[in-house]
């Protein structure tokens, strides 16, 4: 916290101060609280409309949550000398709707970035890479938290939101060192197929609470370091053989699949067989069918092949109107 002013005192064993002013100017920006020992600056719930210019050079952890920043321009944190120690930056819930290219440039130690709970109508492809080069300098980011950044429908650009986020994640191959990526609660209908291939160091991937229907075109093969894959609360109906084989081939992974509307018909047979033998899925005994109606709430692990049938498709000549 900011230092208080002092006045001289004649009491024994007391610090005497030269004047009513602190001897050294306070380095904590207005509307912020600072801890030098924790190397932390908190400018929280202060309705700030821009990033303070006078951030102390010692800052390692910067909280700018609950503000009204609206736009994060290029070089929003660029200072001379640079904020060389800034390692964790939390901008969640600050009403950001636009993050421009190079917004996080000149932060050489930035390892963790949280942009959650901002309605990002525009996320520049170069927000994290800083340049439009085909291969840019590696970003120092290790953890990127982008939960609930989907804007309301009326603020969406013409292009798909999934595509906009994917473009920022793959630009310049800058995020090759990323270990943690959280993309929960973003109404994703699909995961663009090239994204994961550009993030080979991922250990933790959270895609929970989206609207993913299928993983058919998603490849996890490259993610040899993946330890946690969160797919809870999506719209997944079934995992097909290709996906099952890829997940089984990842040496350290734990997959979370709770609360998906699994369709327990003949297409589910391979997944049920796999679930019975795999150690990859956490809480697999909790997975239950949602469809068809006759199978609702049945536990997947308790199904056998006889339970998993598909209604025959009648040839057109036999169909009745």
């Amino acid at each position: 916290t900011s230092s208080a002013s002092s006045s001289s005192s004649s009491a024994p064993f007391l610090a005497s101060a030269a004047s009513a002013q602190p001897p050294l100017p306070d380095q904590c920006p207005a509307l912020c609280e600072c801890s030098e020992a924790a190397r932390t600056v908190k400018c929280v719930n202060r309705n700030l409309t821009e990033v303070p210019t006078d951030l102390p050079l010692y800052v390692r952890n910067l909280f700018l949550t609950g503000n009204q920043l609206a736009v994060l321009p290029a070089g929003a944190f660029a200072r001379r000398p640079p904020l060389a120690e800034l390692a964790a930056l939390n901008l969640s819930g600050s009403r950001l709707d636009e993050v421009r290219g190079g917004a996080f440039e000149h932060l050489p130690s930035l390892r963790q970035l949280d942009l959650s709970h901002n309605p990002l109508a525009y996320l520049s492809p170069f927000a994290f890479s800083g340049s439009n080069a085909s291969i840019s300098a590696p970003s120092p980011l290790v953890e990127l938290i982008l939960n609930h950044i989907v804007p309301p429908d009326d603020k969406r650009q013409n292009r798909s939101f999934e595509g906009m986020v994917a473009a920022a994640l793959v630009a310049g191959r800058a995020l090759q060192g990323l270990h943690l990526l959280e993309l929960a609660s973003n109404h994703f209908l699909y995961l663009p197929r090239d994204v994961l291939a550009q993030l080979p160091s991922l250990r933790y991937l959270d895609l929970s609470n989206n609207s993913l229907v299928s993983l058919t075109y998603v490849s996890f093969r490259n993610l040899t370091h993946l330890e946690s894959l969160h797919l809870e609360d999506n719209a997944l109906k079934v995992l097909h053989n290709g996906t099952l084989a890829e997940l089984q081939g990842l040496p350290h992974v734990r997959v979370f699949l709770d609360n998906n509307p699994w369709v327990c018909d003949c297409h589910m047979a391979d997944m049920v067989t796999w679930l019975k033998q795999t150690g990859v899925v956490q809480g697999k005994d909790r997975l239950t069918c949602a469809f068809p109606e006759k199978m609702r709430n049945r536990v997947l692990l308790e199904l056998n092949s006889a339970d998993l049938d598909c209604d025959p498709i009648l040839p057109p000549s036999l169909q009745t109107s």
């Epitope: 916290t1 230092s3 208080a4 002092s6 610090a15 101060a17 602190p22 001897p23 050294l24 380095q27 600072c34 801890s35 030098e36 020992a37 924790a38 190397r39 102390p56 050079l57 010692y58």
Partner: antibody, heavy 119, light 106 residues
């Protein structure tokens, strides 16, 4: 009002140990590094060490390693320094001071604790 | 360790006289600080970041220097300036003080 209130003067016998205190007011001690400095009679100042009250991490002047031990009690907003195996050469005034990370300097100082080691 | 050598060790000046004292560092530093200590009191930060005056310090004081050589100047000596002045570096461990310059009045 920022103040650093140090414990009173002490007379101790050679070989003894002592613990002196530095109670902070006007600021939260956990937010600032605290440092200790010694001054023998009529001599210059000598930096003893630094403690980060937030993490408990300490950094010592090699010269005082094994002689001084720094600690803090965040709940009472107080910094402490233990001195052990005291000899007459340890007779001095010991100051606590608040360290300013952005300046690499001390801003507020206590009045000092006078230590006399004599048999 | 970075040894700071102050000179002169003792000096006296008449009221109104210009006073300059120096601090030489065995290794280059980017900033030097100066502390004033009056008899039987604790030191006070007087000049920080080489040339900036701490709050309440009279404008007749100034600081300058770079690298290995720094100085503190009083443009016009006054009686209240009688004290010992210490230079200090807090960049490299161990942090070190100069031996001090004791300023007296004629």
């Amino acid at each position: 009002e920022v103040q650093l209130r140090q414990s009173g003067p002490v007379l101790v016998k050679p070989g003894a140990s002592l613990k002196m205190s530095c109670k902070a007011s006007g600021f939260t001690i956990a937010d600032y590094y605290m440092t200790w400095v010694t001054q023998s009679h009529g001599q210059s100042l000598d930096w003893i060490g630094l403690i980060n009250p937030y993490s408990g991490e300490t950094t010592y002047n090699q010269k005082f390693k094994g002689k001084a031990t720094l600690s803090v009690d965040k709940s009472s907003n107080t910094a402490y320094m233990d001195l052990n195996s005291l000899t007459s050469e340890d007779s001095a005034v010991y100051y606590c001071a608040r360290w300013r990370l952005g300046y690499y300097a001390m801003d507020y100082w206590g009045r000092g604790t006078s230590v006399t080691v004599s048999s | 360790e970075n040894v700071l050598t102050q000179s002169p060790a003792i000096m006296s000046a008449s009221p109104g006289e210009k006073v300059t004292m120096t601090c030489s560092a065995s290794s280059s530093v980017s900033y030097m600080h100066w502390y004033q200590q009056k008899s039987s009191t604790s030191p006070k930060v007087w000049i920080y970041d080489t040339s900036k005056l701490a709050s309440g310090v009279p404008g007749r004081f100034s600081g300058s220097g770079s690298g290995n050589s720094y100085s503190l100047t009083i443009s016009s000596m006054e009686a209240e300036d009688v004290a010992t002045y210490y230079c200090f570096q807090g960049i490299g461990y161990p942090y070190t003080f100069g031996g001090g310059t004791k300023l007296e009045i004629k």
